[in-house]
Structure formats: structure tokens, C-alpha cells
């Protein structure tokens, strides 16, 4: 019997509005009261086993005690009524939960979508945390037909799709329901027709097929989504070369209805291209499709668009009558290529003589030729046709080249090394442009660069090394032959010296001393040396420095002490910084020549 | 030379079935997309069906959407037009055409002979 | 779907005039438009694609304008072996391809 509550709470499940005011009250039942002689005075109220203020009880009557709270802030609160019983022991009597929350917003932002081939799916926005099981429910209905409630699952409260077949050019409305303990509210109505909320497929077996007679133009094929037999599609078609990241799209007015083909035009020759395309609603009421997978095709060759880079260098050891010619080329960029290249055709045309062909693989010919004035040409063959002729004037072995371009310099810039100049009066057909390392342990092989006539300023396309000297020399090239070159020394980036200068006495006097040092090797400078600083002193006294243009390779120290040891090293300097040399030693004599103490 | 040679036309009754043929020759068949065209007699020309180059898309004209199917074989330079419940309007030369395209147009050329179909009630 | 209609259906002229059938598109088809000839028992042969591109091996008195929903074939000169019927075909939209119902060029 005494397994019995001893009382009851009431409520005996609230659920109350989040920082609104509550009252609970306790009613104890008339055994319990005789069995522990109590009453009503005797309750203790407490939530979550911590008591609360007598100032919050009101005590009814004999049997009841009643507990307010004001601004209820807890989602959880366990409260129970306890009464004190002999030697001030607690016995519990009832115990309840308040849940506390909040009642629903009006639902916002109600919107549907109708996913090919799938039924029609509506979310919303839920509004504010309720704390409390707040159930969804979307409602649908023709004029003339109610439809089965949707019930939002508890997992996607804010999200449902109806059970029943998606029928278009019928409106619909549509509304949501949101109810829970604290109340229940409709969110606005909307009305539609179905077909204006259409996601389509994405098209699909794109393909891609290119044209042998265009080379500038690729034609996409696919496959409609079923959709297109409901409503008008109009297009997103997007394309990119093979190794770009950001994609180029077709003016939509041109994809703004139904097809299942494009012709896509002004694109580069022997160029792989990826296309996607995705669709939607012509009138734009819907939503697009997803993309398409993506297709790619390799527009066709066309003739090479540029004569290659053409240029010659003669062996200075030549026999009587004879002079070897190296002719050189480079190879063109893809984007002038514009194909595989198969062969170049070289042709020599000795003055006012015969023709001499070659037909070679690789980017340069090695010829014996007579002393005499030549015309070569060059020309670049692909599977589809020859470039223009590069034409080079080989002149006679007596010519004696002039015109040099003028106020020649070279300057590091954005990480690569410009060469500027003024150019000369002359009508110049282009510029070569020769860039060697000039090194003390190998000879300076040479790259190049052609550079049209009317250029002058560029950049060296080679890949060149930090902390290297580099001799660059630019020779304008006339119709009738070289000019003269003119050469400049310039570094990509200067480093201080990876040595400092070895210093040696050459001459030693009582209160002088003459120093002498080598210049330093070209690889060990990192950059064009500026001056030197001579740092001398004695064991005892203070260091002295002195700055030594960078011309000199000796210097005279004097007011020297006599009959002194010295300490010398000396430090050569770029643009970027300097290095110490070896330090050296040597010592003044006590008398001056001829001199007797 | 460029050529396309249509074979398989006939007379079949209504409701029944037949499949013609296209062997095209003189050029790189599996970069072209094809089409067949048909012509009642004393008509004019009306589209029938199309397919990419590499087969992966097909079209139909909704006069024979459901009842006809075009394929290819690249590998034996072979175009297809497989007809079933064949109708009495269904009559016609079927013509195998090579679908050729530039950036501003898509242009049917060469043409084959044609076969005729004749479709008895 | 695009309809094509040609105007005339029919025509009779003589050898040496000049002769002009015009094609028009139920929407715009920019430049997507081709003609072609067809004479009895033949199969359609291309003229002129893309409009106005004369296809190689037509001779140069044919020629093609237009452009939108507008379209004209003109033979400058009409010679013997050009009595045929000619249709103008639509491959802006597609499918499904149109071809115009076709105009009957016979000798006056």
C-alpha cells in the first residue's frame, strides 16, 4: 500500500511556453499525511534535486502546496514534491517534467519542385528552434480534389514529396501545416501549374564531331531528356579547352529552343575541347538540369598559321671558297602549329643560281655553301598544308654588316629579363635576339629568339637561372643581311658572391703597404660586383674599412704603424650583398729601406 | 567518289515488317551523322529518322516514333532503317542521306538512289 | 515544330529568264537553310547550304539570300536543265528537319 504515491502534481505533463510563468501544485493524500503526521507545510519543492525558495511556495490548504516559476528558461526541468518526515529525512512523494518550448511560426518560403520522372517535392523554411516535436504537414489540392496529406519525416522536417502522379497544365495549391503542443499555424498559399516547376534531366549521350573542312568549328549531338515531349527546352551550353579550369559559355540566344544539336564555331585549330550542357523550361519558369556528362572533341588540323623562327650561324673555320651554315628554327607553339608537324622544307637559292631543296625532320641543316650571297626559305608542313615562308638572307662572306640598334639595356622585371633598345633608321624585317651563361668553366652555348620588326622591347623565352650572367646580344636583320650585334651583360637576379676576393700584399713598407687581388671568376660573382671594401687592423686596435671602386685590382694602405702585425681580408659586393674573402696577415718592417735605427 | 546505295524496299502488307540497308563507300563513314528521308509518291521530301556518328543519339519523326529504329554498323560502313507495323502511308522511296554541317547551316549530301516501299492493305 | 512554305508552287518560265522561289520559316532560322533539286525519278540534289553557299560544281547561276524567316533561290539565266522541282529545307531547329512542300519549275 505504501508503494502508493503518497500525493500527485499537477500538471502532470506540462508543456509550457519558453520564459513564460508556471504553477504547479501538490496535493497529498490523507493516509499519507496521518502515516507521517504532515501536512501541506511540510512539502519541499525541488527541481533537478536542488530546493527551491520557500518564497516561490503558496501553501493552499492542509493537503496542497502550489510552486511558481517565473521566465522559464530550461528546455528540461524535473521537478518533485517531497515532504520532511521524522528527523527532517525527505521522502519523495510525486515527481513530473516540464518541457518547455515554443510554439510554431508560419512557414516560409514554400516552394516545389518537380523532378523529372519523379514525383513533386516541396520544402520550406521551418522558422525558429521549437525545442518542442513539431510535425509538418504538407497539404495539396486541384479545385476540385483534395490530395492525401504529405507528413513530414522527423529527420527532414522541412522537406516532402507527395505521394501521388504529377499532373501538368493543372494548378495546384499548395500550403503547409506546422502544429505542436503550443500550437498550430499555416503557412501562405501558393498556386501553380506543375509544368512551371520542372527540373528536366540533363541531356545526355553528348557526343562530338568535328569537321575536315572547318577546322575552327565542332558539332554536339544529344539526347533530349523525355521531358521535351511536355514542355519546350532551352540550353546552357559550356565548353573549355582540355587544360583550362574556367569554362566559356554560348550566348544563350542561341540554344533557345528545343534541338539536340550545336554547332559550336570560332574555336582553334587541333585543339581538344570539353563541352556540358544542361536544360530547362524556354520561358525560364522551372528550374536547369543538372549538367550533362561531359564530352570532348579535337577540332581538325589546319595549315600551319606562322612561318617558324629562322635564323643561321657560320663556322669561323672555313675552307678557301667555302663556308659551313647552320640554319636553325624553332619549333612552333600548338597554337600555331595548329596540327601535327610533319616535316619542314628548306630551299637555298644561291644569287641569281640554281635551287637547292631539303626536306628535314628535325630544327636545323647543316650546309656547305660557296662564299657567295644565298636566299633560304623555310616553310612548316602539317597533314594539312605548308606555312608561309620565313625567308633569310645569307650574305657573301665579304658583306660588312651595319646598322646596330642603339641604346641597348637589359633589366630584370616580374621574374623574367627584358631587353629593350631604340631602333635603328633603317626598315628592319625582324630581330634575333642570342642569350648566353658566360661561365669561366664552359663555353657559352647559346639560345635564341626571333622578335618581329617592329618590336622593341621583349622578354627572353628561355629558361634562365638566378645568380648567372647573362651576354645578350640583339642583331637586327635587314633584307639584305644581318646588321651588326650589339651585346649587353644583364642577371636575372643578382645573389651576393658565393667567394670574396683572396687579398696578398705586392710591397711593403714601413708605413704603407700596396695590396693587389684578382678579379673575381664570373660563376662566383652571382651578379655584377659594384666596389670592394678593404678591412684592415691591428691585434690591438679597431678595424678600419675602405671602399675600393670595383675597376681597381690594387689599393695602397698607408699611415701605417711600423714594426706591426696586420690583419686584412677584403669583401666584394652586389646589388644583393656582399662576401668576405680569406683573411691574410702580414707585417710592417721597423726600419725603411736604407734606414739604420 | 562518294556513294550511298539503299537496298531492301519492297512490298510488304500493312502491319508488317522490313529492314532496309545503306552502304555508303568514299568517305570516313564513322565521322558522318546520317539520316533517312522518304518521298510518297507525287510528294514532297519528308525527315524520317536521324543518327549521330558514333550512334549514341537517334531521332524520329513523329510519323514513325515507336515503329521504326535506325542504326549503324561503323565497322562495315552500314546505315539501317528498321520498319515494323508498317501502314499504307508508310509507302515511299526511302532515301539514305549523309548529314554534312557548318557553323551557320546542317545540309543533307550526297543522296542515295532510294528504295521503294510499298505497303498493301 | 518550324514550317516551311514555298511560293510558288509551281511555275513556268523559259529558257534564259531569270527565275526567283522564295521560302518562308514560321520562326526565325538565322541562316540554317538549304535548297536542293530533284528531278523526275532522281534523287534531291544539294545546291546551295547555309543560305547562300553555292555547294561545289553547281554552276554560279544559281545563287541563295536571305536570312531569318525570309529566304530566295534565284537562277539568273534558266537553262534547259533546270526544270525540276526545288525544295528548301530548315536545320536551325531540329528535330524534326522541314523541308518546304516543294515548287514545280516548268517550261512556259
Known amino acids: 500500500e505504501l508503494l502508493d504515491p503518497c500525493g500527485y502534481i499537477s500538471p502532470e505533463s506540462p508543456v509550457v511556453q519558453l520564459h513564460s510563468n508556471f504553477t504547479a501544485v501538490c496535493v497529498l493524500k490523507e493516509k499519507c499525511m496521518d502515516y507521517f503526521h504532515v501536512n501541506a507545510n511540510y512539502i519541499v519543492w525541488k527541481t533537478n534535486h536542488f530546493t527551491i525558495p520557500k518564497e516561490q511556495y503558496t501553501i493552499i490548504n492542509r493537503t496542497a502546496s502550489s510552486v511558481t516559476f517565473t521566465d522559464i528558461a530550461s528546455l528540461n526541468i524535473q521537478l518533485t514534491c517531497n515532504i520532511l518526515t521524522f528527523g527532517q529525512l525527505e521522502q519523495n512523494v510525486y515527481g513530473i517534467t516540464i518541457i518547455s518550448g515554443l510554439p510554431p511560426e508560419k512557414p516560409k518560403n514554400l516552394s516545389c519542385i518537380v523532378n523529372e520522372g519523379k514525383k513533386m517535392r516541396c520544402e520550406w523554411d521551418g522558422g525558429r528552434e521549437t525545442h518542442l516535436e513539431t510535425n509538418f504537414t504538407l497539404k495539396s489540392e486541384w479545385a476540385t480534389h483534395k490530395f492525401a496529406d504529405c507528413k513530414a519525416k522527423r529527420d527532414t522536417p522541412t522537406s516532402c514529396t507527395v505521394d501521388y502522379s504529377t499532373v501538368y497544365f493543372v494548378n495546384i495549391e499548395v500550403w503547409v501545416e506546422a502544429e505542436n503542443a503550443l500550437g498550430k499555424v499555416t503557412s501562405d498559399h501558393i498556386n501553380f501549374d506543375p509544368v512551371y516547376k520542372v527540373k528536366p534531366n540533363p541531356p545526355h549521350n553528348l557526343s562530338v564531331i568535328n569537321s575536315e573542312e572547318l577546322s575552327s568549328i565542332l558539332k554536339l549531338t544529344w539526347t533530349n531528356p523525355s521531358i521535351k515531349s511536355v514542355i519546350i527546352l532551352k540550353y546552357n551550353i559550356q565548353y573549355r579547352t582540355k587544360d583550362a579550369s574556367t569554362w566559356s559559355q554560348i550566348p544563350p540566344e542561341d540554344t533557345a529552343s528545343t534541338r539536340s544539336s550545336f554547332t559550336v564555331q570560332d574555336l582553334k585549330p587541333f585543339t581538344e575541347y570539353v563541352f556540358r550542357i544542361r536544360c530547362m523550361k524556354e520561358d525560364g519558369k522551372g528550374y536547369w538540369s543538372d549538367w550533362s556528362e561531359e564530352a570532348s572533341g579535337i577540332t581538325y588540323e589546319d595549315r600551319p598559321s606562322k612561318a617558324p623562327s629562322f635564323w643561321y650561324k657560320i663556322d669561323p673555320s672555313h675552307t678557301q671558297g667555302y663556308r659551313t651554315v647552320q640554319l636553325v628554327w624553332k619549333t612552333l607553339p600548338p597554337f600555331e602549329a595548329n596540327g601535327k608537324i610533319l616535316d619542314y622544307e628548306v630551299t637555298l637559292t644561291r644569287w641569281k643560281s640554281h635551287l637547292q631543296n631539303y626536306t628535314v625532320n628535325a630544327t636545323k641543316l647543316t650546309v656547305n655553301l660557296t662564299n657567295d650571297r644565298y636566299l633560304a626559305t623555310l616553310t612548316v608542313r602539317n597533314l594539312v598544308g605548308k606555312s608561309d615562308a620565313a625567308v633569310l638572307t645569307i650574305p657573301a662572306c665579304d658583306f660588312q654588316a651595319t646598322h646596330p640598334v642603339m641604346d641597348l639595356k637589359a633589366f630584370p622585371k616580374d621574374n623574367m629579363l627584358w631587353v629593350e633598345w631604340t631602333t635603328p633608321r633603317e626598315s628592319v624585317k625582324k630581330y634575333i635576339l642570342e642569350w648566353c651563361v658566360l661561365s669561366d668553366k664552359a663555353p657559352c652555348i647559346t639560345d635564341w629568339q626571333q622578335e618581329d620588326g617592329t618590336v622593341h622591347r621583349t622578354y627572353l623565352r628561355g629558361n634562365l637561372a638566378e645568380s648567372k650572367c647573362y651576354l645578350i646580344t640583339v642583331t637586327p636583320v635587314y633584307a639584305d643581311g644581318p646588321g651588326s650585334p650589339e651585346s649587353i651583360k644583364a642577371y636575372l637576379k643578382q645573389a651576393p658572391p658565393s667567394k670574396g676576393p683572396t687579398v696578398r700584399t705586392k710591397k711593403v713598407g714601413k708605413n704603407e703597404a700596396v695590396l693587389e687581388w684578382d678579379q673575381l671568376p664570373v660563376d662566383v660573382q652571382n651578379g655584377f660586383i659594384r666596389n670592394y671594401t678593404i678591412f684592415y687592423r691591428t691585434i690591438i686596435g679597431n678595424e678600419t674599412a675602405v671602399n675600393v671602386d670595383s675597376s681597381h685590382t690594387e689599393y695602397t694602405l698607408s699611415s701605417l704603424t711600423s714594426d706591426t702585425l696586420y690583419m686584412v681580408r677584403m669583401a666584394a659586393y652586389t646589388d644583393e650583398g656582399g662576401k668576405d674573402g680569406p683573411e691574410f696577415t702580414f707585417t710592417t718592417p721597423k726600419f725603411a729601406q736604407g734606414e739604420i735605427e | 567518289e562518294v556513294q550511298l546505295v539503299e537496298s531492301g524496299g519492297g512490298l510488304v502488307q500493312s502491319g508488317g515488317s522490313l529492314r532496309l540497308s545503306c552502304a555508303a563507300s568514299g568517305f570516313t563513314f564513322s565521322r558522318y551523322e546520317m539520316n533517312w528521308v522518304r518521298q510518297a509518291p507525287g510528294k514532297g521530301l519528308e525527315w524520317v529518322a536521324y543518327i549521330s556518328n558514333t550512334g549514341t543519339t537517334r531521332d524520329y519523326s513523329d510519323s514513325v516514333k515507336g515503329r521504326f529504329t535506325i542504326s549503324r554498323d561503323n565497322a562495315k560502313n552500314s546505315l539501317y532503317l528498321q520498319m515494323s507495323s508498317l501502314r499504307v502511308e508508310d509507302t515511299a522511296v526511302y532515301y539514305c542521306?549523309?548529314?554534312?554541317?557548318?557553323?551557320?547551316?546542317?545540309?543533307?549530301?550526297?543522296w542515295g538512289q532510294g528504295t521503294l516501299v510499298t505497303v498493301s492493305s | 515544330d518550324i514550317q516551311m512554305t514555298q511560293s510558288p508552287s509551281s511555275l513556268s518560265a523559259s529558257v534564259g529568264d531569270r527565275v526567283t522561289i522564295t521560302c518562308r520559316a514560321s520562326?526565325?532560322?538565322?541562316?540554317?537553310l538549304n535548297w536542293y533539286q530533284q528531278k523526275p525519278g532522281k534523287a534531291p540534289k544539294l545546291l546551295i547550304y547555309a543560305a547562300s553557299s553555292l555547294q561545289s560544281g553547281v554552276p554560279s547561276r544559281f545563287s541563295g539570300s536571305g536570312s531569318g524567316t525570309d529566304f530566295t533561290l534565284t537562277i539568273s539565266s534558266l537553262q534547259p536543265e533546270d526544270f525540276a522541282t526545288y525544295y528548301c529545307?530548315?536545320?536551325?531547329?531540329?528535330?524534326?528537319?522541314?523541308f518546304g512542300q516543294g515548287t514545280r519549275l516548268e517550261i512556259k
Open positions: 529545307q530548315q536545320s536551325y531547329s531540329t528535330p524534326p528537319i522541314t
Open positions: 542521306v549523309r548529314e554534312k554541317f557548318s557553323g551557320t547551316s546542317d545540309w543533307f549530301d550526297p
Open positions: 520562326q526565325s532560322i538565322s541562316s540554317y
